[in-house]
């Protein structure tokens, strides 16, 4: 019977995606989460709305990706940040932005950053601004790994399901 | 016999690449286009040309990549832009560049954005500027499914197989 | 018989690409290389150290990773750079920063990019700067192929292993 | 079943040269590298490098830069190693070799003994 | 050039034995590492690779492991046709080379 055998996830994916009556051998875990658009000052990663998605063992852990089993995996994320031009009266401060992708591991106390893109932004007069930033990348992991980012600028984030993602899937 | 109930275009890479005496249930399709340098103020992209491919499937029709079968891909694009100094006599006025991946789907009567990325130049005097984008992500997607770019810049584009392309591949 | 069922381009794949004929079926080739943060003026790449790793084949030369069986493979490299502001007494000149991943095969006396990524900076007074490169795509590649880097700005590079590095993966 | 045939060694004059040759079938020749690999007598074993029948790609251990060619005939599926200037100490059994993933020595030839003396 | 030390450089066992047999990069090589065997007068035969994989139609008593500078090759059970040289050999860069051999011989 279709999704037999298979993970709760799994057996969805193969109702929903007939193509794969999949043995467990060729399960593949895969995971695309976008930033809640609702929450302003924050980035929350969501996947249950739009494009995203959990498969095949993936869940979401304290807004981090938990690792299903052990493997390579190609992990990425994307942010796009946008500003308005600063009033004549302020004086213009430089803005840091950054974004990066982090492991917390057993192995380790702290967090590792495995992925990590950064940029100084000097509003200007009558000048709006926009950046994207993305990063992706194969890593080793292990079963149980949990995949976060931290993001400088959050308030200037575009929040919407196709500028600011976070992902991974297995090799 | 070799080639027998395939594509054409499949039969030619298995000759190129005999690599791959795969049985179906490992057919991998992938596709990897250049935007067309002859086409100065157009993005036209192209499969049959240096280093791009159409593989196990995959196929252009209307400027856009058509899914093979259902499941999941990793979709990616990256554009090049470039500009010289404004002139003194010129106003210099702001230039947004923007590159999008967007999903048309018999399921939605609007092209979705997948992937956007969006900055805006300043041009200065003597200033020649250079800007790169790049995205990539996981989608579920249905047999079917088109797979398309939307660019705000083009005149800017900076057309070569190495800087200007869209690809996808199926986990 | 090889190909059979295949479509027409899968069956030139299959004879073109023979594939793993192995216990090898289940080989990932993978890689993902670092910058070495104690080469502060070039850029030497690292398999053997944090995160980075060769899997299943892949093996360096001359700081050129070599394609350990023929196929199709996702390649990537990110670099970010950073600089100070210039002196009041110095004049700006402006930076020109690249990055590029290329192919060094002797089908070809050359070496052809596959992946570029450029900008210029304008370093100002008071004003350090940042700025990330990110690209990856697919592309068919041959067993003893060399892919290699080429990065105009080196001495700016922020070395760190979440911030330069190249790799590559089999589809 | 995949076979390497070499030939060519023998008896070579320091400071002569010499051209071997490895016949290889029951693969598709053009889908992997050719090897060569030699082995002093009583000794270890070397890699010289390698050449891609494909697209005549190659790779040289840095010590036979200079010295050592090898190359490939797609028609005739055989691969050669052309070594100059031999000496005394170029005095080995040579081995083609046919990797799977590239680095891995998967299938070896009955190997081919080239003595440098005069 | 990465050096690869392999000790012992010969030793002897009995049928029957566990045997190991070790190897020491110069660096660091990730898991880069492969193991053959060779017999007087023949070509060597590929054992393991990846320093754990076994190859195609190697039988179960081998068995490879180590990463990073030491890597060991373990024959559980020592059969008769098991008697030869044994070469480590890493693949993390170019030029491969290969460790000195280690020859087990019948006590």
């Known amino acids: 019977l279709p999704g037999v055998g298979l993970t709760p996830s799994a057996a969805q994916t193969a109702r929903q995606h007939p193509k794969m009556h999949l043995a467990h051998s060729t399960l593949k875990p895969a995971a695309h989460l976008i930033g809640d658009p609702s929450k302003q000052n924050s980035l929350l990663w969501r996947a249950n709305t739009d494009r995203a998605f959990l498969q095949d063992g993936f869940s979401l852990s304290n807004n981090s990706l938990l690792v299903p089993t052990s493997g390579i995996y190609f992990v990425y994320s994307q942010v796009v940040f946008s500003g308005k031009a600063y009033s004549p009266k302020a004086t213009s401060s430089p803005l840091y932005l950054a974004h990066e992708v982090q492991l917390f591991s057993s192995q380790y106390p702290f967090h590792v950053p495995l992925l990590s893109s950064q940029k100084m932004v000097y509003p200007g007069l009558q000048e709006p601004w926009l950046h994207s930033m993305y990063h992706g990348a194969a890593f080793q992991l292990t079963q149980g790994d949990q995949l976060s980012t931290h993001t400088d600028g959050i308030p200037h984030l575009v929040l919407s399901p196709s500028t600011v993602f976070f992902g991974a899937f297995a090799l | 016999l070799p080639g027998v109930g395939l594509t054409p275009s499949a039969a030619q890479t298995a000759r190129q690449h005999p690599k791959m005496h795969l049985a179906h249930s490992t057919l991998k399709p992938a596709a990897h286009l250049i935007g067309d340098p002859s086409k100065q103020n157009s993005l036209l992209w192209r499969a049959n040309t240096d280093r791009a491919f159409l593989q196990d499937g995959f196929s252009l029709s209307n400027n856009s990549l058509l899914v093979p079968t259902s499941g999941i891909y990793f979709v990616y694009s990256q554009v090049v832009f470039s500009g010289k100094a404004y002139s003194p006599k010129a106003t210099s006025s702001p230039l947004y560049l923007a590159h999008e991946v967007q999903l048309f789907s018999s399921q939605y009567p609007f092209h979705v954005p997948l992937l956007s990325s969006q900055k805006m130049v300043y041009p200065g005097l003597q200033e020649p500027w250079l800007h790169s984008m790049y995205h990539g992500a996981a989608f579920q997607l249905t047999q079917g499914d088109q797979l398309s770019t939307h660019t705000d810049g083009i005149p800017h584009l900076v057309l070569s197989p190495s800087t200007v392309f869209f690809g996808a591949f199926a986990l | 018989l090889p190909g059979v069922g295949l479509t027409p381009s899968a069956a030139q794949t299959a004879r073109q690409h023979p594939k793993m004929h192995l216990a090898h079926s289940t080989l990932k080739p993978a890689a993902h290389l670092i910058g070495d943060p104690s080469k502060q003026n070039s850029l030497l790449w690292r398999a053997n150290t944090d995160r980075a790793f060769l899997q299943d084949g892949f093996s360096l030369s001359n700081n050129s990773l070599l394609v350990p069986t023929s196929g199709i493979y996702f390649v990537y490299s990110q670099v970010v750079f950073s600089g100070k502001a210039y002196s009041p007494k110095a004049t700006s000149s402006p930076l020109y920063l690249a990055h590029e991943v290329q192919l060094f095969s002797s089908q070809y006396p050359f070496h052809v990019p596959l992946l570029s990524s450029q900008k210029m900076v304008y370093p100002g007074l008071q004003e350090p700067w940042l700025h990330s490169m990110y690209h990856g795509a697919a592309f068919q590649l041959t067993q003893g192929d060399q892919l290699s880097t080429h990065t105009d700005g080196i001495p700016h590079l922020v070395l760190s292993p979440s911030t330069v590095f190249f790799g590559a993966f089999a589809l | 079943e995949v076979q390497l045939v070499e030939s060519g060694g023998g008896l070579v004059q320091p400071g002569g040269s010499l051209r071997l040759s490895c016949a290889a079938s029951?693969?598709?020749?053009?889908?992997?590298?050719i090897h060569w690999v030699r082995q002093a007598p009583g000794k270890g074993l070397e890699w010289v490098g390698y050449n891609n029948p494909y697209n005549d790609g190659t790779n040289y251990n840095e010590k036979f830069k200079g010295r050592a060619t090898i190359s490939s005939d797609k028609s005739k599926n055989t691969a050669y190693l052309q070594m100059n200037s031999l000496r005394a100490e170029d005095t080995a059994v040579y081995y083609c070799?046919?990797?799977?993933?590239?680095?891995?020595?998967?299938?070896w030839g009955q190997g081919t003994l080239v003595t440098v003396s005069s | 050039d990465i050096q690869m030390t392999q000790s012992p450089s010969s030793l002897s066992a009995s049928v029957g034995d566990r045997v190991t047999i070790t190897c020491r990069a110069s660096?660091?090589?990730?898991?880069?590492v492969a193991w053959y065997q060779q017999k007087p007068g023949k070509a060597p035969k590929l054992q393991i690779y990846?320093?754990?994989h076994r190859y195609t139609g190697v039988p179960s008593r081998f068995s490879g492991s180590g990463s990073g500078t030491d890597f060991t090759l373990t024959i559980s059970s020592l059969q008769p046709e098991d008697f030869a040289t044994y070469y480590c050999?890493?693949?993390?860069?170019?030029?491969?080379?290969f460790g000195q051999g280690t020859k087990v011989e019948i006590k």
């Open positions: 029951g693969y598709t020749f053009t889908s992997y590298v």
């Open positions: 990846s320093a754990s």
């Open positions: 050999q890493e693949s993390y860069s170019t030029p491969w080379t």
């Open positions: 070799s046919r990797p799977t993933m590239l680095p891995w020595f998967a299938y």
């Open positions: 660096q660091a090589v990730s898991s880069a």
